[in-house]
C-alpha cells in the first residue's frame, strides 16, 4: 500500500543515459513524450516528481521493515496528467488523471548510481521505463538494455 502523503515533491529535468532529453510536446491538443537531443542552451522540459513511501507484505522476508520509494510523474506544463505504464502494448503514455493516480502511474525508484535512477512499474515488477526508438517504452531489465533504463534527474 502507498502511504497517503507525499514525502517530497520536486521539479527536475529528465534525461537519458545518452544525455538526450525527455520532453513533452503538444500535438493536436494532447501531450506526447519525445526523447531527443537537446541543445546546450535550450531550456529542458521539467517533470514534477512526487515521492511516496510504500510498505508491502511480510512474505518479502523483511517483515514490516520492507519499504520502497515510489514516484509518480507529471509534465510541469500540466500537472493533472501522469506518466502511465500501459501493460497492453508496453508503452508509456500521458493520461489525464482522476483524483488519485492509478497503480499504473506509480514507479518504484531504483537508485542505480549516485547519478542515475531507474523507474520500475509498480504493477509490472521487473519492467522499467526505457528508451526505444526515441520514445519511452516499457522494457524488461537485462544486460543489453541496462543503459536504456537509466535516467538522470537534474534539479533546475
Amino acid at each position: 500500500s502507498i502511504q497517503g502523503t507525499s514525502l517530497l515533491t520536486e521539479s527536475c529535468a529528465l534525461s537519458t543515459y545518452n544525455d538526450q532529453s525527455v520532453s513533452f510536446v503538444l500535438e493536436n491538443g494532447c501531450y506526447v513524450i519525445n526523447v531527443e537531443d537537446c541543445g546546450k542552451n535550450q531550456e529542458k522540459d521539467k517533470v514534477l516528481l512526487r515521492y511516496y513511501e510504500s510498505s508491502f507484505p511480510a512474505q518479502s522476508g523483511d517483515g514490516v521493515d520492507g519499504k520502497k520509494l515510489m514516484v509518480n510523474m507529471s509534465p510541469i506544463k500540466d500537472t493533472d496528467i501522469w506518466l502511465n505504464a500501459n501493460d497492453k502494448d508496453y508503452s508509456v503514455e500521458l493520461q489525464k488523471g482522476d483524483v488519485s493516480p492509478p497503480d499504473q502511474a506509480f514507479f518504484v525508484l531504483h537508485k542505480k548510481s549516485s547519478d542515475f535512477v531507474s523507474f520500475e512499474c509498480k504493477n509490472l515488477p521487473g519492467t522499467y521505463i526505457g528508451v526505444k526508438d526515441n520514445q519511452l517504452a516499457l522494457v524488461e531489465e537485462n544486460d543489453e538494455s541496462c543503459n536504456n533504463i537509466m535516467f538522470k534527474l537534474s534539479k533546475m
Epitope: L7, K68, L69, H110, K111, S113
Partner: antibody, heavy 122, light 107 residues
Framework: EVQLVESGGGLVQPGTSLKLSCLAS????????MTWIRQAPGKGLEWIAS????????YYPDSVKGRFTISRDDAKSTLYLQMNSLRSEDTATYYC???????????????WGQGTLVTVSS | DIQMTQSPASLSASLGETVSIECLAS??????LAWYQQKSGKSPQLLIY???RLQDGVPSRFSGSGSGTRFSLKISGMQPEDEADYFC?????????FGSGTKLEIK
C-alpha cells in the same frame, strides 16, 4: 529482526591494512544500499563508503579514496571494508549501516551495527 | 561538498522543557535530511528522516521541520532519556555529510 554485526577491528600499525566485515541478517540484503560510517573517539560522525544494492557502484569521500574499498558478498549477506595504508587519523569506531528503502539511498540510516573499534598506532 | 553547520554545540534543558536544534546547509537541497540520537557508548539511532518523518518507534515528542538550507529538530517536553548527542545528516548529494553534533544535557 534486522541485525548488523561488525567484526575485524583491532590495533594496527600505521601503513598496514585491515579488513572489516559486517554480517547482515533479518532482511533481504541484496535489495539495499549499504554504507560504512565512522566515529573518531569523542568526535562526530563521518561517512566513509557506500555501495549500491547491485554492487556495481561504490562511493567514497576524498579522505579515504584510493585507500579504502567497500565490497559486498550477497550470497553471504556480508559487507566488507578493506582498509589499506592506515593512518593514525583513521582511528575510530566503524559502523555498518543499511539504507531506509529498497534500492535507494533516500531517508537516512535506520539500522546500525554495534561498531568495531580500529586503533592505528605505533 | 554540502557543509552542515549545527547549533548549538551543547545545550542543557530542564525536564519538560521544549528544546530546538538547528542545522544550516551551505547550499539548498531537497528534504533528504535525517536526525540521529546517540546515547553514550551506543550506536546512533535514526529519529527523523525526510526532514519531518518520524521513524517507527520514536516518541512523538520528537519532530523535524525545514527545507532548503534550514532544518530543525524539536523535542517537546524534555525527558531524562533524551540526554544524548544529536546529529543531522544530508543524503541529497555525495559526499554524505553530518553536522558536528549537539550535546543535550539535563539541567
Amino acid at each position: 529482526e534486522v541485525q548488523l554485526v561488525e567484526s575485524g577491528g583491532g590495533l594496527v600499525q600505521p601503513g598496514t591494512s585491515l579488513k572489516l566485515s559486517c554480517l547482515a541478517s533479518g532482511f533481504t540484503f541484496n535489495n539495499y544500499w549499504m554504507t560504512w560510517i565512522r566515529q573518531a573517539p569523542g568526535k562526530g560522525l563521518e561517512w566513509i563508503a557506500s555501495i549500491t544494492y547491485t554492487g556495481g557502484g561504490t562511493y567514497y569521500p576524498d579522505s579515504v579514496k584510493g585507500r579504502f574499498t567497500i565490497s559486498r558478498d550477497d550470497a553471504k549477506s556480508t559487507l566488507y571494508l578493506q582498509m589499506n595504508s592506515l593512518r593514525s587519523e583513521d582511528t575510530a569506531t566503524y559502523y555498518c549501516t543499511r539504507a531506509n528503502y529498497y534500492y535507494n539511498t533516500y531517508g537516512g540510516f535506520p539500522y546500525w551495527g554495534q561498531g568495531t573499534l580500529v586503533t592505528v598506532s605505533s | 561538498d554540502i557543509q552542515m553547520t549545527q547549533s548549538p554545540a551543547s545545550l542543557s534543558a530542564s525536564l519538560g522543557e521544549t528544546v530546538s536544534i538547528e542545522c544550516l546547509a551551505s547550499e539548498g537541497f531537497s528534504n533528504d535530511l535525517a536526525w540521529y540520537q546517540q546515547k553514550s557508548g551506543k550506536s546512533p539511532q535514526l529519529l527523523i528522516y525526510a526532514a519531518s518523518r518520524l521513524q517507527d518507534g520514536v516518541p512523538s515528542r520528537f519532530s523535524g521541520s525545514g527545507s532548503g538550507t534550514r532544518f530543525s529538530l524539536k523535542i517537546s517536553g524534555m525527558q531524562p532519556e533524551d540526554e544524548a548527542d544529536y546529529f543531522c545528516q544530508q543524503g541529497s548529494k555525495y559526499p554524505l555529510t553530518f553536522g558536528s553534533g549537539t550535546k543535550l544535557e539535563i539541567k
